[in-house]
Interface confidence: low
């Protein structure tokens, strides 16, 4: 048994009247005192009860008492209106002791057998309380053998009286510019034996304002000022309170940025407490006026410490602080009531002077030198020799500060050289090589680099030529001496160009025939286009209609003449296109290998001979007039021919350019 040495006697047993189960004698008095350990009580019930019945049990009786309280006075066998017999009732001590007294008077009218009772100690459940009684514990009650203990909900701590739960309500710091605080459990009754401290701590420059809201109910006393529970408000300047009772205290303007609120409660009372809504104020800053063409956000009635505003400019205007552009602008109100930075301006976006257009010019449309938002400029290309590619040349100054085309492009338009212009009148004699005049073949390029060769200018920075003519220089492009704008091969007056890179067709195999005999040279600088330097056009899809058998093409160059010398002056010859089968047959016999003439070649010349291109003309253009566009285009590139130039029954063979348009376009666009 857990009762220990202090409780040697058993805490259960049997009691009976003297002589039981026989009749009890007269004039008997017997007293039993039963004691249980602390935290336990005694339970008693009767298994037999037979005593003389008398009014109010004055004669014979069993009296049960616990401490000073009489639990029951029992007699008879069954209860009546005024007397009580135990029946099946169970009796409990109020504490840990129970006194049982048996008494019989001097006589019995008939024999009575008395009583038999059993008792036992049992644990008291201190947590069970009668209706209307105060609970054992404030929050949670836990019963155990021989005792009980109390515990508290989260946010509370058990008071040293072991029953009351005091609120853990100190150390809360409020740093927001406004907020609410209240007594614990508000609007339910606040806890007892608690001491709460709340702090409002705002940045220097703010002043806290306290408003009591909803209801106020703190235990009070009619004569003494707040002796039980009270609320006090302390600032660095003064103390307000104590407050108690049921009247809402007035607004408190603390004129301080720090406030301490103390709330103390005692062990009694049942009151709902208080609720405070706090706000803050500060020295307002001057009201911001938006600059012209700008607006303030957010718009407030006033701006105080830590408040901020931003300035946003209308489309087409930019923020400037003084004369310096800002990515964004936000000003913050300081504690002294001044803004931390001056108001910016919204200045109209200025795209600045437009860039110069190579081979073109720009005109101010809106007004002379006007370069601000929505201003319009018009680019145009130098007439005759240049034309504008894609673009209409109209640009507007947009809000991002860039000149922008109607298609949304921010890059300059491109002035592309006009191709295929020639001073030559058409319909000249076919027979006999003739001297070219200025402007006749402005696309003609002289290539010097080991041997003399020719090429044709494409656009303003590419030269089309034969692969065999530049094969040796493919890895040393800078060795090529490129000259244009001259008629005389040896003249010191020419436009010099240098090669940046040489692109030889990947299908060309040197010294194994002339299939794919085509190459492109990229110049390291653009050349200026004029009447003596103009690019040749590439053939349109429809160009084959101008290159049928017997159609006349013109070859030009400084190659060998009939006298066996390189021409001093640029020469040209008008020659007809030869039927492809006829040309193939001409080169099927020795010393030419079979298949010398391929589908990538075209032939031109007279069956009788005498008119042909020759060594030194390689790479030059065989050109045709497109009668629809009235522009010259390159149909062939001087490639190869018979051992003897101008031989009867043999023809000049030219690379068929129209087969290579995709290859040409790919290289030019990629590089």
């Amino acid at each position: 048994t857990p009762l220990g040495p202090k409780w040697p006697e058993p805490v259960f047993g049997r009691l009976a009247s003297p002589g039981f189960p026989g009749e009890y004698a007269n004039d008997q008095e017997r007293r039993w005192t039963l004691t249980a350990p602390p935290g336990y009580r005694l339970r008693l019930y009767f298994t037999h009860f037979d005593l003389e019945l008398s009014h109010l049990c004055e004669y014979d009786f069993v009296k049960l008492s616990s401490g000073a309280k009489v639990l029951a006075t029992l007699c008879g066998q069954e209860s009546t209106d005024t007397e009580r017999a135990p029946g099946k009732d169970t009796f409990y001590s109020l504490g840990s002791s129970l006194d049982i007294t048996f008494r019989s008077d001097y006589s019995n009218e008939k024999p009575f057998t008395g009583f038999e009772a059993f008792y036992a100690a049992e644990d008291i459940d201190e947590c069970q309380v009668a209706p209307g009684e105060a609970p054992t514990c404030d929050h949670h009650c836990h019963n155990h053998l021989g005792g009980f203990y109390c515990s508290c909900r989260a946010g509370y701590v058990l008071h040293r009286n072991k029953r009351t739960c005091s609120a853990l309500c100190s150390g809360q710091v409020f740093t927001q510019r406004s907020g609410e605080l209240s007594s614990p459990e508000y609007p339910r009754p606040y806890p007892k034996l608690s001491s709460c401290t709340y702090s409002i701590s705002l940045e220097e420059g703010f002043s806290v304002i306290l408003d009591f809201v909803e209801s106020f109910d703190v235990e009070t006393h009619p004569e003494t000022l707040c002796p039980y529970d009270f609320l006090k408000i302390q600032t660095d300047r003064e103390e307000h309170g104590p407050f108690c009772g049921k009247t809402l205290p007035h607004r408190i303007e603390t004129k301080s940025n720090t406030v301490t609120i103390t709330f103390v409660t005692d062990e009694s009372g049942d009151h709902t407490g208080w609720k405070i809504h706090y706000t803050s104020t500060a020295q307002p800053c001057p009201y911001p006026m938006a600059p012209p063409n700008g607006h303030v956000s957010p718009v407030q009635a006033k701006y105080i410490l830590k408040d901020s505003f931003s300035i946003f400019c209308e489309t087409g205007y930019e923020l400037l602080q003084g004369h310096l552009p800002l990515k964004s602008f936000t000003a913050v109100c300081q504690k002294d009531g001044s803004w931390d930075r001056p108001m910016p301006a919204c200045s109209i976006v200025d795209c600045g002077p437009p860039d110069d257009l190579p081979s073109g010019r720009v005109e101010y449309i809106t007004g002379p030198g006007v370069t601000t938002y929505k201003a319009v400029i018009q680019y145009s290309c130098e007439e005759t020799f240049y034309t504008m590619k894609v673009n209409d040349g109209k640009y507007v100054c947009e809000a991002d500060g860039f000149w922008t085309s109607s298609k949304g492009e921010k890059s300059l338009p491109v002035c592309e050289p006009v191709c295929g212009l020639s001073a030559r009148t058409t319909g000249g004699r076919i027979y006999g090589g003739q001297k070219a005049k200025p402007g006749d073949f402005p696309w003609q390029v002289l290539i010097l680099g080991g041997t003399t060769a020719a090429g044709a200018l494409l656009y303003d920075n590419w030269v089309l030529t034969a692969a065999h003519a530049v094969y040796e220089q493919k890895h040393d492009a800078s060795a090529l001496d490129i000259r244009m704008g001259t008629l005389k091969r040896l003249s010191p007056h020419y436009t010099q160009a240098w090669s940046e890179a040489v692109f030889i067709h990947e299908g060309y195999t040197h010294d194994a025939g002339f299939d794919n005999d085509i190459a492109l040279i990229k110049l390291n600088n653009k050349v200026v286009i004029n009447s003596n330097i103009t690019p040749i056009c590439l053939p349109r899809k429809e160009a084959e209609s101008f290159m049928r058998t017997d159609d006349i093409g013109t070859a030009s160059g400084w190659g060998l003449t009939q006298r066996g010398f390189l021409a001093r002056n640029l020469m040209y010859v008008d020659i007809p296109i030869v039927d492809h089968q006829k040309c193939t047959a001409a080169y099927e016999k020795p010393p030419y290998p079979r298949g010398s003439v391929t589908a990538n070649m075209l032939c031109a010349g007279l069956e009788s001979g005498g008119k042909d291109s020759c060594r030194g003309d390689s790479g030059g253009a065989l050109v045709f007039l497109d009668s629809e566009t009235e522009r010259w285009f390159v149909g062939g590139i001087v490639s190869w021919g018979s051992m003897n130039c101008g031989e009867a029954g043999q023809y000049g063979v030219y690379t068929k350019v129209i087969n290579y348009i995709p290859w040409i376009e790919n290289i030019i666009s990629d590089f």
């Epitope: 602080q321 003084g322 800002l326």
Partner: antibody
Framework: EVQLVESGGGLVQPGRSLSLSCAAS????????MAWVRQTPKKGLEWVAT????????YYRDSVKGRFTISRENAKSTLYLQMDSLRSEDTATYYC??????????????????WGQGVMVTVSS | NIVLTQSPATLSVTPGESVSLSCRAS??????IHWYQQRSNESPRLLIK???RSISGIPSRFSGSGSGTDFTLSINRVESEDFSIYYC?????????FGAGTKLELR
């Protein structure tokens, strides 16, 4: 340590030209707006011109507009002031100065953090 | 242009004294005032930016205050190295201007 060293000053006749240079070291030159400020005993300190960190914009005081050109070469960490059509009132000590980092606090600040030792320009016949 | 007037033109003090230098703007410049120190035969040095913001490396005895049109540079307990000319400068308008300066000299 931030260092700004001006050079190119000297005596020049009215109407002639002079070019000042400022070699910068000890900081990321292309993060800073740069300025020229001049000083005379009579007029005191005068802001002359400012150029943005990337060279995209230039600003001048009214009296030098059209005559002076501020420029910079970020690769060489060098600031320049080309002074044409010089007048006697341009006589001053010219200082090269940083005008604080362009990204500082989300806006461009108009004060001069670091100054060179100054170079004397005398315009006289 | 915004004119900055500095007063007094000259201030005579002994080391250990505390002084205040004034700068007045011809119109409100908010807090866009900056202070510089120029010792004899040296270039100007930035002391205070935006009226009251300190600059790293500048002794804490230098402080600035003011907004709108009236600004003050305070030196707490002047030291011998502080005898210089002090200039204020505004960046409120696009044409930066400087004051004529206050000379702090040894009494």
């Amino acid at each position: 340590e931030v260092q700004l060293v001006e050079s190119g000053g000297g005596l020049v006749q009215p109407g002639r030209s002079l070019s000042l240079s400022c070699a910068a070291s000890g900081f990321t030159f292309n993060d800073y707006n740069m300025a020229w400020v001049r000083q005379t005993p009579k007029k005191g300190l005068e802001w002359v011109a400012t150029i943005l960190f990337d060279g995209s914009r230039t600003y001048y005081r009214d009296s030098v507009k059209g005559r002076f050109t501020i420029s910079r070469e970020n690769a060489k960490s060098t600031l320049y002031l080309q002074m044409d059509s010089l007048r006697s009132e341009d006589t001053a000590t010219y200082y090269c100065s940083t005008e604080s980092p362009y990204y500082s606090e989300g806006y461009y600040q108009g004060y001069f953090d670091y100054w060179g030792q100054g170079v004397m320009v005398t315009v006289s016949s | 242009n915004i004119v900055l007037t500095q007063s007094p033109a000259t201030l005579s003090v002994t080391p250990g004294e505390s002084v205040s230098l004034s700068c007045r703007a011809s119109q409100s410049v908010s807090t866009s005032i900056h202070w510089y120190q120029q010792r004899s035969n040296e270039s100007p040095r930035l002391l205070i930016k935006y009226a009251s913001r300190s600059i790293s490396g500048i002794p804490s005895r230098f402080s600035g205050s003011g907004s709108g049109t009236d600004f003050t540079l305070s030196i707490n307990r002047v030291e011998s190295e502080d005898f210089s000319i002090y200039y204020c400068q505004q960046s409120y308008s696009s044409l930066y201007t400087f004051g004529a300066g206050t000379k702090l000299e040894l009494r």
